[in-house]
C-alpha cells in the first residue's frame, strides 16, 4: 500500500491580529500508528505548537475529533493571533515508539498577520 503523505493544502494563510487562524493538515493513511505534532519553523530551533499525545496548548484547538482512531484530519485553530505568531507551520507525523520518532512532515503553511482592522 502507498506510503503515508502529510498534506498541508494551504501554502499561505493571512489572518488579522486578534482573530483565529485555521491551519489545515490531513494524512493519507492510518499507518504507521503514531501522533501528530505541529511546529512553527523547522530545524533545531523549531517550536512545538501542539502535540496530539500530550501537553497543554491553551490557544490551540483541533478542528475535528483528532482522538478518534480513524481520524485523518489534524487541522488546528490558533486563537487570538498576534504578530509574534507569524511564521511557517509544519504538521509532522510521528511513528509510535519509545520514544516516538519523526516520520514525515507536511510542506508547511506560512502564516502572516495583518494589522487589526480599526
Amino acid at each position: 500500500e502507498e506510503e503515508l503523505q502529510v498534506i498541508q493544502p494551504d501554502k499561505s494563510v493571512s489572518v488579522a491580529a486578534g482573530e483565529s487562524a485555521i491551519l489545515h493538515c490531513t494524512v493519507t493513511s492510518l499507518i504507521p500508528v503514531g501522533p501528530i505534532q505541529w511546529f512553527r519553523g523547522a530545524g533545531p530551533a523549531r517550536e512545538l505548537i501542539y502535540n496530539q499525545k500530550e501537553g497543554h496548548f491553551p490557544r490551540v484547538t483541533t478542528v475535528s475529533e483528532s482522538t478518534k482512531r480513524e481520524n485523518m484530519d489534524f487541522s488546528i485553530s490558533i486563537s487570538n493571533i498576534t504578530p509574534a505568531d507569524a511564521g511557517t507551520y509544519y504538521c509532522v507525523k510521528f511513528r509510535k515508539g519509545s520514544p516516538d520518532t519523526e516520520f514525515k512532515s507536511g510542506a508547511g503553511t506560512e502564516l502572516s498577520v495583518r494589522a487589526k482592522p480599526s
Partner: antibody
Framework: QVQLQESGPGLVRPSETLSLTCTVS????????WSWIRQPPGKGLEWIGF???????FYNSSLKSRVTISLDMSMNQFSLKMTSVTAADTAVYYC????????????????WGQGTTVTVSS | DIVMTQSPLSLPVTPGEPASISCKSS???????????LDWYLQRPGQSPQLLIY???NRASGVPDRFSGSGSGTDFTLKISRVEAEDVGVFYC?????????FGGGTKVEIK
C-alpha cells in the same frame, strides 16, 4: 536574489572584541537560520554558530564562552561578537543563510557572503 | 560532536574524466524521517564556498548535473561524471543533522 554583505574592522588587537555585521538584502530574514563560519589562512571551514529568526541561538561549544550572535530584523542584519581574541582567531569570516524545512536538521547553506578578513595583531 | 572525515586529501584529475570524493561521519546522518543530513560544498580559489548537494543527494539550484551525491548513514560519495576546468578548488562535506555543524577537512581537486 538574496545577497549577504559582511562589514567590520579588518584589524583587531589581541584581548579585544571582534564585531562583525552581516546585511541581508533582497529577501526576508524570516524562516531561515543565519550563520557565521570562519576559515583560518590556508585551513578548512569552522562553524561558529547561528541564530534563527525567532531569536534562538546555537554556538560551537569550542567558542561558546566568547561568542554572541544577535539579530535585528528591522534592519535586516545579524551580528557576531567574539571577545578576548587571539592570533588564532585570525581568519576570513563568512556570514551565510541556512535553509530548514525538512524536520530537525538543515537543508543546505545556500547563500554566502563574500567573506571579510579579520587579522588579530598588535 | 560529529567528526567528518574526507578522502582523498588531494585529487589530481584529467578534464573529461570522472572523479569521486568520499566522506565518512562518526555517527549516522540518517534521521528517522528518511533524510540524510549531509551537504557538499565547493570552494573555488579566492571565492566563498557554494552549495552543491544537500540532504545527501539533492542538487542545489543551478548546479550542473555532472555533480551527484550518494550514500546513506555514515558513508557518502560526491561524484563528478566529467571533470571540467572550472571544477578545481576544495570540496567540503558538512553534516547538518545536529549542532555544532561540522565540516570535513576538504579535498583539493586540481588539474593534472
Amino acid at each position: 536574489q538574496v545577497q549577504l554583505q559582511e562589514s567590520g574592522p579588518g584589524l583587531v588587537r589581541p584581548s579585544e572584541t571582534l564585531s562583525l555585521t552581516c546585511t541581508v538584502s533582497g529577501g526576508s530574514i524570516r524562516n531561515y537560520y543565519w550563520s557565521w563560519i570562519r576559515q583560518p589562512p590556508g585551513k578548512g571551514l569552522e562553524w561558529i554558530g547561528f541564530i534563527y529568526y525567532n531569536g534562538r541561538t546555537f554556538y560551537n561549544s569550542s567558542l561558546k564562552s566568547r561568542v554572541t550572535i544577535s539579530l535585528d530584523m528591522s534592519m535586516n542584519q545579524f551580528s557576531l561578537k567574539m571577545t578576548s581574541v587571539t592570533a588564532a582567531d585570525t581568519a576570513v569570516y563568512y556570514c551565510a543563510r541556512v535553509r530548514a524545512y525538512s524536520g530537525i536538521g538543515l537543508d543546505g547553506t545556500d547563500v554566502w557572503g563574500q567573506g571579510t578578513t579579520v587579522t588579530v595583531s598588535s | 560532536d560529529i567528526v567528518m572525515t574526507q578522502s582523498p586529501l588531494s585529487l589530481p584529475v584529467t578534464p573529461g574524466e570522472p572523479a569521486s570524493i568520499s566522506c565518512k561521519s562518526s555517527q549516522s546522518l540518517l534521521y528517522s524521517n528518511g533524510y540524510n543530513y549531509l551537504d557538499w560544498y565547493l570552494q573555488r580559489p579566492g571565492q566563498s564556498p557554494q552549495l552543491l548537494i544537500y540532504l545527501g543527494s539533492n542538487r542545489a539550484s543551478g548546479v550542473p548535473d555532472r555533480f551527484s551525491g550518494s550514500g546513506s548513514g555514515t558513508d557518502f560519495t560526491l561524484k563528478i561524471s566529467r571533470v571540467e576546468a572550472e571544477d578545481v578548488g576544495v570540496f567540503y562535506c558538512m553534516q547538518a543533522l545536529q549542532t555544532p555543524l561540522t565540516f570535513g577537512g576538504g579535498t583539493k581537486v586540481e588539474i593534472k
